[in-house]
């Protein structure tokens, strides 16, 4: 619209910036006339180094525009964010981060995996965007359940573990020695009785991993951020719901000596039937009655639930009984068992379909006389607690 004011000078004809156009185009622009600049897709209005959403200039009385014409600068998504436990490759060209440039995120092979294809494109809004329209980074999830340990399916005596056999094994040092199992890069699964009283006094919980020797001076240190004890657990009143989670302050780096154990799939029950063999490791008491210096393991079969419950009716453990939330493992004749100091560790099974190990039980309780005849080890039945575990982890 023209507003003719004879006392004022016309403004110079505006020139559209490269990759942009002006509107409206007029023969002359006089006082109070205005024009806007629009950039083509993939370009943005820049006034110096500052982005603008829109631009309109107004002709002033002195015949000048009230602001200078901006540039239409190609959208630059900037250097992509670093991917924890992964890396990024420039597909379009070295360091090319402008409109329609493509990058490829990948996870560190062997120990981490990505659910998406990791391809991102610099879009017109200035954000790196995945093929699914996500602007957030992909996630490199730790691989779980890989082990150098091979279960022969037969009972062998407790023996020392080798590097990489039980990379999920966590040593918990407090007033007593206990264990746990890494289930994410920042979560440890353990027994409630092993960390009872630690929800407030967390600083007294020393978490070590990546070790075989209990007293090793070289280890990966972790500290608890929070401890979650199952709300159904009552200390000193049996071991029902003897399960807890420890949230670590920092994520640990996954390698062949530190790796989470998988949580059981829905089909896991079929792999944990009576006489199926699981493996348990720990630094607990050995036959000699002392804590083990080296991480020890034993392959032990699952015992019929009723048979186990009956055995503990005959020779009761003070204040404890076998419930549906427990599973038992051991030999009728005894000799192979977990013991004090092993508490919180994982009883693991090999999933033949995925060739990954998963946690089926948590070392919970058993006869004072570890490994005694018909004195089976009792373990928290992890399959009963998958919703509880996932709820805590997802809502933290």
């Amino acid at each position: 619209h023209h507003h003719h004011h004879h006392a004022s000078q016309p403004c110079p004809d505006p020139t559209a910036p490269p990759n942009g156009h002006i509107s409206p185009v007029q023969a002359t622009y006089v006082l109070k006339d205005s024009f806007s600049v629009f950039c083509k897709t993939g370009f943005e209005l820049l006034q110096g180094s500052v982005p603008l959403k829109s631009f309109t200039a107004v002709c002033q009385k002195d015949g000048s525009w009230d602001r200078p014409i901006p540039e239409c600068s190609i959208i630059d998504c900037g250097p992509p964010d670093d991917l924890p436990n992964g890396h990024v490759d420039y597909i379009t060209g070295p360091e090319v981060t402008t409109y329609k440039a493509v990058i490829q995120y990948s996870c560190e092979e062997t120990f981490y995996t990505m659910s998406s294809n990791g391809k991102y494109v610099c879009e017109a809004d200035g954000f790196w965007t995945s093929s699914k329209g996500e602007k957030s980074l992909p996630v490199c999830k730790p691989v779980c359940g890989l082990s150098t340990h091979t279960s022969g399916g037969r009972i062998i005596g407790g023996q020392p573990a080798k590097p990489g056999d039980f990379p999920w094994q966590v040593l918990l040092l407090g007033e007593t020695t206990a264990a746990g199992a890494l289930i994410h890069d920042d979560w440890v699964l353990t027994a409630a009785h092993a960390v009872y009283g630690k929800t407030e006094a967390m600083s007294s919980l020393d978490i070590r991993m990546g070790i075989l020797k209990r007293l090793s001076l070289i280890y990966t240190q972790a500290w608890p951020e929070a401890v979650f004890i199952h709300e159904g657990y009552t200390h000193g009143a049996g071991f029902d719901n003897d399960i807890a989670l420890i949230k670590l302050k920092n994520k640990v780096t996954i390698n062949r000596n530190i790796m989470p154990i998988c949580l059981p799939r829905k089909e896991a029950a079929s792999l944990m039937k009576t006489d199926f063999v699981g493996t348990v490791a720990g630094w607990g008491l050995t036959q000699k009655g002392f804590l083990a210096r080296n991480l020890m393991f034993v392959d032990i079969p699952i015992v019929d639930h009723q048979k186990c419950a009956t055995a503990y009716t005959k020779q009761p453990y003070p204040g404890a009984k076998v419930t549906v939330n427990m599973l038992c493992a051991g030999l009728d004749r005894g000799g192979k068992d977990s013991c004090r100091g092993d508490a919180g560790g994982a009883l693991v099974f090999l999933d033949n379909e995925t060739q990954r190990w998963f946690v089926g039980g948590i070392v919970s309780w058993g006869s004072i006389n570890c490994g005694g005849s018909e004195q089976y080890g009792v373990y928290t039945k992890v399959t009963n607690y998958i919703p509880w575990i996932e709820n805590i982890i997802n809502n933290f």
Epitope: Q47, G48, S49, V50, P51, L52, K53, S54, D66, R67, P68, G78, D125, G126, F127
Partner: antibody
Framework: DVQLQESGPGLVRPSQSLSLTCTVT?????????WNWIRQFPGNKLEWMGY???????SYNPSLKSRLSITRDTSKNQFFLQLNSVSSADTATYYC???????????WGQGTTLTVSS | QTVLTQSPAIMSASLGERVTMTCTAS???????LLWYQQKPGSSPKLWIY???KLASGVPVRFSGSGSGTSYSLTISSMEADDAATYYC?????????FGAGTKLELK
Amino acid sequence: DVQLQESGPGLVRPSQSLSLTCTVTGYSITSDYAWNWIRQFPGNKLEWMGYISYSGRTSYNPSLKSRLSITRDTSKNQFFLQLNSVSSADTATYYCAIISTAVDFDYWGQGTTLTVSS
Amino acid sequence: QTVLTQSPAIMSASLGERVTMTCTASSSVSSSYLLWYQQKPGSSPKLWIYSTSKLASGVPVRFSGSGSGTSYSLTISSMEADDAATYYCLQYNRSPLTFGAGTKLELK
């Protein structure tokens, strides 16, 4: 009338993180412009820290990039500064501001004083 | 980054005196993207001049700004008591945005 108001803790311990909020009234932070954080040291030197634009894109001063994050909550018309691993050198008055882009549209908060001390 | 050097760091002027302070850039800056701020103790900086020479609303006409390339200046034609303050230049031609160290103007 456009107004910006900073809020923050006043005192932060060394090595901890600093979090500040800028609440904007009278103008939507998604409408236009870049929303800046600027600080002024005890000797009066001014330093631009970074901005978050109307679209949510950020630009940071390279000297602070490794420690700095600027985010926003469009539903509350607020934008935020987080500065990690602070030291006594981060003691300053922190301002949020819209800096004039060649027009007379320039607004600053009144500033919030931050001391880093154990 | 573009370094802005202001001079003098401190100056004093008598009432009615003409005052000029400079802002020198380490690399060329578009005149469209150079600002001046005035700051008084206990207050936030106030936009004083934008696009090198345009006065922000409410700024007295005794103030003027000029310059191009790497050399810019702010001038007060006739010093008044209310002009005593610190003046900062700022460029946003390229990132990072940078301020000058300021010129403190005192009343003699």
